[in-house]
Amino acid sequence: EEELQVIQPDKSVLVAAGETATLRCTATSLIPVGPIQWFRGAGPGRELIYNQKEGHFPRVTTVSDLTKRNNMDFSIRIGNITPADAGTYYCVKFRKGSPDDVEFKSGAGTELSVRAKPSAPVVSGPAARATPQHTVSFTCESHGFSPRDITLKWFKNGNELSDFQTNVDPVGESVSYSIHSTAKVVLTREDVHSQVICEVAHVTLQGDPLRGTANLSETIRVPPTLEVTQQPVRAENQVNVTCQVRKFYPQRLQLTWLENGNVSRTETASTVTENKDGTYNWMSWLLVNVSAHRDDVKLTCQVEHDGQPAVSKSHDLKVSAHPKEQGSNTAAENTGSNERNIY
């Protein structure tokens, strides 16, 4: 009679994470008598996966009834597969011996490969806000996928970005992989409503890529522009001066009025109006009693936006001239206007 052969018909098996893997194995003869064992790996360090004789193997079931005398099918199923289960599995026949069974013949091995989905991409931006025209970096990370091949793309408002660097880790063979990408984005004043999207495509996703997003509203700071204007006279000796604070983001803003360098009033932006691009406008006014001043008055609107150094705009109010209804665009009233940083 021909000597027993152990047949593992599948050279490789590909299984999705969470599914059940079937590893096929048959013997060509009932002789010699003895159990079979399944191992992962070869050599002394091989790991025991299933022992027909004894042991507790909660994830393993046999395809056929191994207790039947004429059984020659030693296939097994391994449930709830994870990437850590990848490897080469050997079906090994033992000959009954005393005191121990003796290894008789091994199958050629079946390589189990596991397909695992990438985790949802997580996009993170810079720790501190940046202003328009500056370049900021965004990172995207996704983990736990297998096989290694993966595609990552970056978009800003639907437009694909090209300035990014991507690494898939580790370089060598592994049970599962991670991807890390860094994209550079140039901010514009219109980016309050913009989104940066990281898109990951993998064979396990069946053409439906995963996306991670970051809102540029978390990243951008649009500094305000200031305009100080003198409004028409309300009463004989009162002048209304307004400070228009335009196109700023985020909303956090504090405004201080100074009369000849002395603090007159401080207020926090509350009832702002929102522009289409997501930036805000706000207006503050100051009623100046001209009769209380003998000399010309320098009015300064000083704005501290989002914890940044203050910016200011000044306006010279002439008290020598008789107050009359006029705007701020007359030469006399605008001569002292300037913009400076207060530190």
């Epitope: 790996g41 002394p44 360090g45 370089v171």
Partner: antibody
């Protein structure tokens, strides 16, 4: 959590015997090969012996015929019987779990064996 | 028996710098080479196996590479906890599982 705890080390004279134990927990002991590795004071690592899941034993030439590795699966314990000890056997003895890739992924803290007259 | 030769014996590096050291096998081991880290008074810790596969929980700053029988371990940016002795080990399918003599990475 995988844990390996060695015991049985101590001071012996040349020619004497010692039996080291390694108690394993946190993994299915019966499913993995286990090994002994030693480190002489101020020296590098030296593989000593390994026992496979089926009980097959392997030894370094330097200990062959003097040391015996064994396992008690019911107690999840690995042993190393050391006979005919020599001064050059003085070392910290580590036990380690062996992966199917034949690398040692978890190690005990070691037990010191000193052979001196 | 496969002999593994590590070089240099000692490497002096400043924190934040890149550290690279090698292990040469006396005969072919394929990609079956592992790296371990050992700190004073501690047991060794598996870092890398199969020449370039990081073990579970090992940071990405550790990477391995192979060129024939020459293997390299690189630590991209040394952290204070990385100052230790590093050993290579061949893990072909059959014993003896030999180790290299070790490379000590010390603070410059």
């Amino acid at each position: 959590d995988v844990q390996l705890v060695e015991s049985g080390g101590g001071l012996v004279r040349p020619g004497e015997s010692l039996r080291l134990s390694c108690a394993a927990s946190g993994f299915t002991f019966t499913n993995y090969a286990v090994t002994w590795v030693r480190q002489a004071p101020g020296e590098g690592l030296e593989w000593v012996s390994l026992i496979s899941v089926t009980g097959t034993t392997y030894y370094a030439d330097s200990v062959k015929g003097r040391f015996t590795i064994s396992r008690d699966n019911s107690k999840s314990t690995l042993y190393l019987q050391m006979n005919g000890l020599r001064a050059e056997d003085t070392a910290v003895y580590y036990c380690a779990k062996v992966t199917w890739k034949n690398v040692f992924d978890y190690w005990g803290l070691g037990t010191l064996v000193t052979v001196s007259s | 028996e496969i002999v593994l030769t590590q070089s240099p014996g000692t490497l002096s590096v400043s924190p934040g710098e890149r550290a690279t050291f090698s292990c040469r096998a006396s005969q072919t081991v394929g990609s079956k080479l592992a790296w371990y880290q050992q700190k004073p008074g501690q047991a060794p810790r598996l870092l890398i196996y199969d020449a370039n596969t990081r073990a579970t929980g090992i940071p990405a700053r550790f990477s391995g590479s192979r060129s024939g029988t020459e293997f390299t371990l690189t630590i991209s940016s040394l952290q204070s906890e990385d100052f230790a002795v590093y050993y290579c080990q061949q893990h072909t399918d059959w014993p003896p599982y030999t180790f290299g003599g070790g490379t000590k990475v010390e603070i410059k």
